[in-house]
Structures are given as C-alpha cells and as structure tokens.
C-alpha cells in the first residue's frame, strides 16, 4: 500500500507587466501528473509583501492568479499543490511548498523619493496629487508620475505637471474614464544628474479620496413659532444626493454653538422666541454607501437670518393667524360666559418649549 | 415616514458587510474559502451560493439572510452563470471586501434591484 | 420581536375577491423576502406566494394568475390580492418572512381565515 | 412537482421518549452538496415555527433536544427526549424545486 504524493507546481514566478504593482503569479503543473488525469487539481497558493504579518491565501485550479501589491516592499509568495480527497480515496495529499520572491532593486537612497504624496479627487471629476521633492536633492532633480487601472492598456505619464521652481510638485490628471472602485496605481520616479532618486509607490481608490463641492443655496423656512428648517442643495456635478453626509454648524445670536451630521439636505432646528439671529454654514462628504473614506468639502458660504427677518416672517406666517384666532376666542368666550360653564378651559400656547 | 426609496435594502446589506469588516478581529470565520464569483449578473445569487457554504459562523449569518432577500427562490441553472466558473476560492474576509465594494458601486450608480 | 400581523379574511363567493394584508414590525422588512402560505381546514401547508425585497415575485402554478403579491416598504404591509377565487382556496392565510431557500420560512404570523362558499 | 413523503402520519410517545420522523422526497432536494429541506413545528391553533433549516441546523431559539439529518431523498427529525410542549403536528418542506412543497404532517401525541 504505497502512499500517495504529489509535486510541487513547476516554474513558479511572479510576473511584473509594468502596471506599477499589479502583478501576475504563475505557475506550471507538477510533474508526473499521469496517475491522475482524472483528477482536477488544485493549487494553494499564499503570498504577502514582506513584512506583513499576515499571508493571503487562494486555492485555484488555473495556473495563474493576478493581485496588487506594494512595489515599495518585496513580495515573497509560496504554492503547492493539493490533490482533493476525491483522487486519493482518502484524505487530501499535498506537496511541498514552491517559492518564489520579487522585488524592485531599489535606486538611490530612501530620502531622495519624494515626500508628503497627497492625492485629491475633487468632486469626484479632477484628480490632482501633489509631494515634495526628497530631502536634499538638487535642483537639476526632476520627478516624473505613471499611473495605472484595470482598463488601461499600458501605464500612462502624467502630461500635465504643477511646478515650482522648474521641479514637478503635482500632476494634474485627465477626465479618468471607468477609474474608480478598482485599485489605482501610481509610480512618481526622479531623474538627476548627480545621484540616483528612489521610485515612490502607491495605491489608492479613487472614490475614497473624494473631496465634493460645498453645498449650495442655503435657506431658512419657520415651520412653526418653535421651529426653523434649514436647506441647501447639492452642488453641481457627478455625485448623486444618495452618496452624501453633511456637517452643519449652527450659531444663534453668536453665542450657542451647533453641530450636527445629517444624511439629508435638511436640518429641523428648535428655536426660541428671543431668538434675534441665526447664522449656519454646512460642509458635505461622501458617506459609507459609496466609498470607505472621504474628505469634507469646504464649508459653504454662511447664511443669515436677522432677527428683524425673523421678526417679521414670524408675524407673517404665525402671530396674525394666531393673534386671529385669540380674538376669535376670546369673542366665543365671551359668548360662552354667558351660558352656564359646562365647557372645558382652553389655554392658547404662547411659549415654545425648550 | 414617507416612501421608503429603493436604495433602502441596499443601505441595510452595506450597513451590515461595513460592520462585519469593522468588527473584525481574528480572521472572518476563521479563515474559510469561499469560492469567488463574477460580480455581474445575478450576482446577490452567486454571493449567497458561495457564502452558504460556511458554516458555524454566526458573523455572516444575517449576510447570508439578507442576501437571500434579493434571492429568495433557487435558482435555475439555465438562467445564470456567475457561479457556474468555481475555479478559485477566496478567503472570507477577502470576499466581503470584494462583495462591499461591488455594492457600493450599485450603489453609487443607482443600481438597486 | 418580530411579529407579523394578517388581515382581511373573510367569507366570499365563488369567483370573488379579496384582498389580505399583513403587518410586520421587529426587523427590517424591506431587507427580506416575505410569503404568503396556507392551510385547508385539517390539512397540511401550501406555499402560495413570494416577493424578493426588490419585488421579483414567484407563484405556484395553482394560485399563478389568479393571485397578487405585492409589498409596500413604507408601510412595512405585505399583500395578497385574490381574484376568481375556488371553494379549494379556503384556508388560513399566513404571512410569513422568508429567509431565502437556504433557511425557510423564519416567522409566521397568526393567520387569517378565507372561506370562499356560496 | 417534487412530494414530500411524512412517516408516520401520527405517533404516540411519552414524556422523556426518543422520537423520530422521517421524510422521503420523489426527487432528491440537494444544491452544491446542501439539502434544502426544513422542519416546523405547528400546535393546534397556532402558526408554524421553524424548527431546522437545511435538513440539520437548528434555528435560534430552538431547544438542543431536536436534531435533523439526511441528504438527498431521505431524512429525520428527532426529539431526543420528548418534552409536554412537544405534543404537536411536525411538517418537512423542501425549497430546492419551484412549487416549494411541504410533506403531510406527523402529528405527536401523548400515549
């Protein structure tokens, strides 16, 4: 009863096609697979940037697997190959582990890679990053930005660089077609005549670096003598209202200070009658049904209501009505006293509760 | 309360999935493989049919209850085949990223049913 | 607590309507898929109707046709519009939320009697 | 359609008895290696109540005396020891096949 085994996959590598850190792993079958044409079989394969503390881990019966990575690490990866149960009459068989590595050789020394990379999608339409030049690199030093997405044939340079200085600081880039919600890639690599410049990696999603417009056209309506509705509409642009947060901030007669988060392009706000002023600015970022993360907006142009407006608006919309319907009252009353008291009191609400 | 938008069920299976993500402290169903699907067509069926295999973990239960709201019926072979490709697992945790991300695009997009 | 409350049973002739409405409080309801199932006096259970939360509905040949389900999220109602309806339809109606093909039918509410006679 | 077959139609056991009802389906009701068939429990005047999904997973709540198993066309419901408020009509159901079709009931009664 001899024991069954199995060889590792042959030719196991990883493959960098120049797409700034998606890379591919591939792999060849065993040899010596003749005893088991009937059998599909599969491989584990496990594989991490090093110095992470934890492995990613797939089974596939292909020969291949693509994923992203950090190209500013190594990436070590090991495979062997399983031969389920259903082969085997028995347990699953598998073999020893193949491994393979890959890293850039890494230019220049790490302070000469660029500095506080920051990237912006404004308004989910423009994308613009920015960095500054590595520690003590000289002037005649130049950066230049690839990037890189699923949809993309090839990595494309930036052709629109910020500059300061004659050094590149920032790109702004193209309308992106069909580049968020997939991992985008970019490389911001250096040339000098003097000394070699380290590449920077990085990757990012573009829906979760997003900063909106701030909401515009902010509004007051009095619902009621104790109520205040406060609006503003979304600004222009590709981001449906589904996708927002909002942050208000509130001051009444420059002292109370409000804030809220709310869902919705309206805030309910209780006031008081000696109410005189009421001023409020809202800011706006993308919520968690549509991206991971987010930035707020700037805050809006501030919007105020004089307490003369409120006055007025006050009289308008509730005290006539209400000054009616007491003389109203009073008049029945009036009428009522007459007769035999049989009727219950009824006290007008001249005060809001707060 | 006023109509209830057809986002409503899509926000709920987000709110969840965000939450299992955030919550995670060991690995998710302590590291089970799932096959992974093509997230297009009939794509609530095919997350069910590869989730259902785990078991013993109540973490993606209510996942796995919710999606059967978009699913509730088998379905027949014929009509899709997001599933019918099972050549790769994934772990767990790797899919309810993919899953969540997939969702959030529907949702983005306006694509709630 | 989920609970799931049916209405609107009753008696009706042959060939008429009616129209049973349920309830649900205690859980999400536009995020399940719910049912419609009944039982003949001293029989065993027929499963007569289903709606996913995006409202695909599925039916049994016997009832395909003649009855409706249909969901009102805002309510958090679900309905069962019974139209030609035959001696053979008199049941207990229950409402129930179904956790898919994979759990069942998870609640069941009280049910409501339909007697279709003449 | 796809019958489900309930055996026996009626039973009488004691307090404390092993009980145990099976149910047969025409066709087999396994998708992907799980068994689409569950169990409910029904008193008189009462709605059903779930008892297991999938041929063995007890829904929440459910006492750990009930158990379900089998694959394919044959399966069992058991009440390891059967308790007063277990005297009641037992139903299976598969949902692998459209109709969804539920067996004729076992109704447990007190001997």
């Known amino acids: 009863d001899t024991e069954i085994k199995v060889n590792p996959p042959q030719d196991f590598e990883i493959v960098d096609p120049g797409y700034l850190g998606y890379l591919y792993l591939q792999w060849q079958p065993p040899l010596s697979l003749d005893h088991f044409k009937e059998c599909t079989v599969e491989y584990e394969l496990k594989y991490r940037n090093i110095g992470s503390e934890t492995w990613k881990t797939i089974i596939t019966k292909n020969l291949h697997y693509k994923d992203g990575f950090d190209l500013n690490k190594g990436i070590e990866a090991k495979i062997h190959t399983l031969l389920p149960w259903q082969c085997t009459n028995g347990s699953e068989v598998q073999s020893s582990w193949a491994e393979t590595t890959y890293w850039i050789s890494p230019q220049g020394i790490p302070e000469t890679k660029v500095q506080d990379m920051d990237c912006v999608y404004y308004n989910w339409q423009y994308l613009l990053c920015s960095w500054k030049p590595g520690i003590g690199v000289l002037l005649d030093t130049n950066y230049n930005l690839f990037y890189w997405y699923e949809g993309l044939d090839h990595a494309l340079q930036c052709v629109d660089y910020i500059k300061a200085d004659g050094q590149n600081i920032g790109c702004r880039f193209p309308y992106l077609e069909a580049s968020d919600y997939k991992d985008f890639y970019i490389c911001v690599n250096g040339s000098s005549e003097n000394k070699p410049i380290r590449s920077s990696y990085f990757t990012f999603q573009l829906q979760n670096i997003v900063k909106p417009l701030p909401p515009v056209y902010l509004t007051f309506t009095r619902e009621s003598s104790c109520e205040i509705k406060l609006k503003w509409s979304i600004p222009l642009g590709p981001i449906p209202a589904r996708c927002f947060d909002y942050e208000i901030e509130i001051r009444e007669d420059d002292t109370t200070l409000v804030t809220a988060t709310v869902e919705n392009e309206t805030y309910t706000l209780k006031t008081t009658n000696e109410t005189r002023q009421l001023c409020f600015v809202v800011r706006s970022k993308v919520n968690i049904y549509c991206s991971d993360d987010g930035i707020w907006s700037e805050w809006s142009d501030k919007q105020c209501w004089e307490g003369e407006d409120l006055s007025k608006k006050t009289l308008l919309r509730f005290w006539l009505p209400f000054g009616f319907i007491l003389i109203l009252v009073i008049f029945v009353t009036g009428l009522l006293l007459r007769k035999p008291n049989t009727y219950p009191k009824m006290i007008p609400e001249f005060f809001c509760d707060t | 309360p006023g109509p209830v938008p057809p986002s409503t069920a899509l926000r709920e299976l987000i709110e969840e999935l965000v939450n299992i993500t955030q919550n995670q402290k060991a690995p998710l169903c302590n590291g089970s493989m799932v096959w992974s699907i093509n997230l297009t067509a009939g794509m609530y069926c095919a997350a069910l049919e590869s989730l259902i295999n785990v078991s013993g973990c109540s973490a993606i239960e209510k996942t796995q209850r919710m999606l059967s709201g978009f699913c509730p019926h088998k379905v027949s072979a014929g009509q899709f085949s997001s599933l019918h490709v099972r050549d790769t697992k994934i772990e767990v945790a790797q899919f309810v990223k993919d899953l969540l991300l997939h969702l959030k695009k529907l949702f983005r997009e306006g694509r709630f049913n | 607590e989920v609970q799931l409350v049916e209405s609107g049973g009753g008696l009706v002739q042959p060939g008429g309507s009616l129209r049973l409405s349920c309830a649900a409080s205690?859980?999400?309801?536009?995020?399940?898929?719910m049912s419609w199932v009944r039982q003949a006096p001293g029989k065993g259970l027929e499963w007569v109707a289903s709606?996913?939360?995006?409202?695909?509905?599925y039916y049994p040949d016997s009832v395909k046709g003649r009855f409706t389900i249909s969901r009102d999220n805002a309510k958090n109602s679900l309905y069962l519009q019974m139209n030609s309806l035959r001696a053979e339809d008199t049941a207990v109606y229950y409402c129930?939320?179904?956790?898919?093909?994979?759990?069942?039918?998870?609640?069941w509410g009280q049910g409501t009697l339909v007697t279709v006679s003449s | 359609d796809i019958q489900m077959t309930q055996s026996p139609s009626s039973l009488s056991a004691s307090v404390g008895d092993r009980v145990t009802i099976t149910c047969k389906a025409s066709?087999?009701?396994?998708?992907?290696?799980?068994?689409?068939m569950h169990w409910y429990q029904q008193k008189p005047g009462k709605a059903p109540k779930l008892l297991i999904y999938?041929?063995?997973n007890l829904e929440s709540g459910v006492p750990s005396r009930f158990s379900g198993s089998g694959s394919g066309t044959d399966f069992t419901l058991t009440i390891s020891s059967l308790q007063p408020e277990d005297f009641a009509t037992y139903y299976c159901?598969?949902?692998?096949?459209?109709?969804?079709?539920f067996g004729g009931g076992t109704k447990v009664e007190i001997k």
């Open positions: 159901q598969q949902s692998n096949e459209d109709p969804w079709t």
């Open positions: 066709e087999s009701v396994d998708n992907y290696g799980k068994s689409l």
């Open positions: 129930a939320r179904l956790d898919g093909y994979y759990f069942g039918f998870a609640y």
């Open positions: 999938r041929a063995s």
């Open positions: 709606i996913s939360s995006g409202g695909n509905t």
């Open positions: 205690g859980f999400t309801f536009i995020s399940y898929a």
